[in-house]
Amino acid sequence: PPRGRILGGREAEAHARPYMASVQLNGAHLCGGVLVAEQWVLSAAHCLEDAADGKVQVLLGAHSLSQPEPSKRLYDVLRAVPHPDSQPDTIDHDLLLLQLSEKATLGPAVRPLPWQRVDRDVAPGTLCDVAGWGIVNHAGRRPDSLQHVLLPVLDRATCNRRTHHDGAITERLMCAESNRRDSCKGDSGGPLVCGGVLEGVVTSGSRVCGNRKKPGIYTRVASYAAWIDSVLA
């Protein structure tokens, strides 16, 4: 049986997700992120809420957070651009673009991920991959190496049931099932990848993990294509 990675997943194949980023605060993993262009990482706006006095950096090319790896490199952040409509008390518009101090050195372990521009819902039941260095069990253990899990997309109507997220899931958000397998604390800002394309970003709300009645919530990147393009331009 799975030994509780991400929640209910497993250790990722090293460097098989070259788009994966660790957004770090004062040298410690804070949130996930995804390289969407040579000099830009997409993450979640809420991740930087408490980072006012700290040093924010982005780690690329990593599998282990602690061990030396030839592909690993820590980049300073030149500019942090949260979505203008993001707010501390809601999960809406929970996107953040981080401009690296320089273009990332690309290679087999560092490569941008194509992101979805067609604003159409992913079909319910589609298996999507979510990865991160977030907690891996209900004790709160944090892993050193990247973890991942495959999750089926959940239709919005089910996700919006009163027993689930009670109408909070707008058309700009999507859900994935959370029955024991789930993204969790520390995975926020990381990528939800369907068919090799970035479809969603893990939101950073205060959701209970691994409870099937509280599905994972992801910001649909296609719904924010215009904003992403305007910042990257």
């Epitope: 049986p1 799975p2 030994r3 509780g4 209910g8 410690a28 408490d50 907690i135 891996v136 069990n137 209900h138 004790a139 709160g140 253990r141 944090r142 604390k185 520390g186 205060s206 209970v208």
Partner: antibody, heavy 113, light 106 residues
């Protein structure tokens, strides 16, 4: 070095309440879960509950529901356990722990008239 | 809630001897933690997620198991291993402990 410093021993009367503290150093309590564990004299360990200090979400073993309250103050990097309506059955050592990997030294609570 | 039964409750072993203790779950769990506690001290985690050795724990300790049956093994008993050992499951809320196995040195 990660450390959890717990408050000192308590001698309290039956029916009273007590609030224990657990102050963390060298890590941010918001990054993981903080748990409280009870150990009665010469007995085993019992999980009381946990808190996610980032948002205040808590989870308790049902048998401690109504007896225990767990809170956290992220500005002081401290977790708290409050116990109410104390009886002799609550006489125990109470441990705080970060994600079950680092543990405080324990706080002894004695309930006696 | 899931009841964890540890056996034996008390055991003794000579230095250098192999020691195995078990933790039986009332229903299936996905993974197990093991802790060591010496008198007057706080518990310390030995094994997480069934078989992973915690930082700083000697390699003579190992964990294994699945479903309802889990075990902790000490490949060669040392005097400093005399302690009480607890299992705990992190699969199903509430997250229960076993009653403990007290290991003494012969």
């Amino acid at each position: 070095e990660v450390q959890l410093q717990q408050s000192g021993a308590e001698l309290v009367k039956p029916g009273a309440s007590v609030k224990l503290s657990c102050t963390a150093s060298d890590f941010n309590i918001k990054d993981t879960y903080m748990h409280w564990v009870m150990q009665r004299p010469e007995q085993g360990l019992e999980w009381i509950g946990k808190i996610d200090p980032a948002n205040g979400n808590t989870e308790f073993d049902p048998k401690f529901q109504g007896k225990a309250t767990i809170t956290a103050d992220t500005s002081s990097n401290t977790a708290y356990l409050q116990l109410t309506s104390l009886t002799s059955e609550d006489t125990a050592v109470y441990y705080c722990t970060r994600a079950m990997d680092y543990w405080g030294q324990g706080t002894s609570v004695t309930v006696s008239s | 809630q899931i009841v964890l039964t540890q056996s034996p409750a008390i055991m003794s072993a000579s230095p250098g001897e192999k020691v195995t203790m078990t933790c039986s779950a009332g229903s299936s769990v996905s993974y197990m933690y093991w802790y060591q506690q010496k008198p007057g001290s706080s518990p310390r985690v030995l094994i997480y997620d069934t078989s992973n050795l915690a930082s700083g724990v000697p390699v003579r300790f190992s964990g294994s198991g699945s479903g309802t049956s889990y075990s902790l093994t000490i490949s060669r008993m040392e005097a400093e291993d005399a302690a009480t050992y607890y299992c705990q499951q992190w699969s199903n809320y509430p997250y229960t402990f076993g009653g403990g196995t007290k290991l003494e040195i012969k």
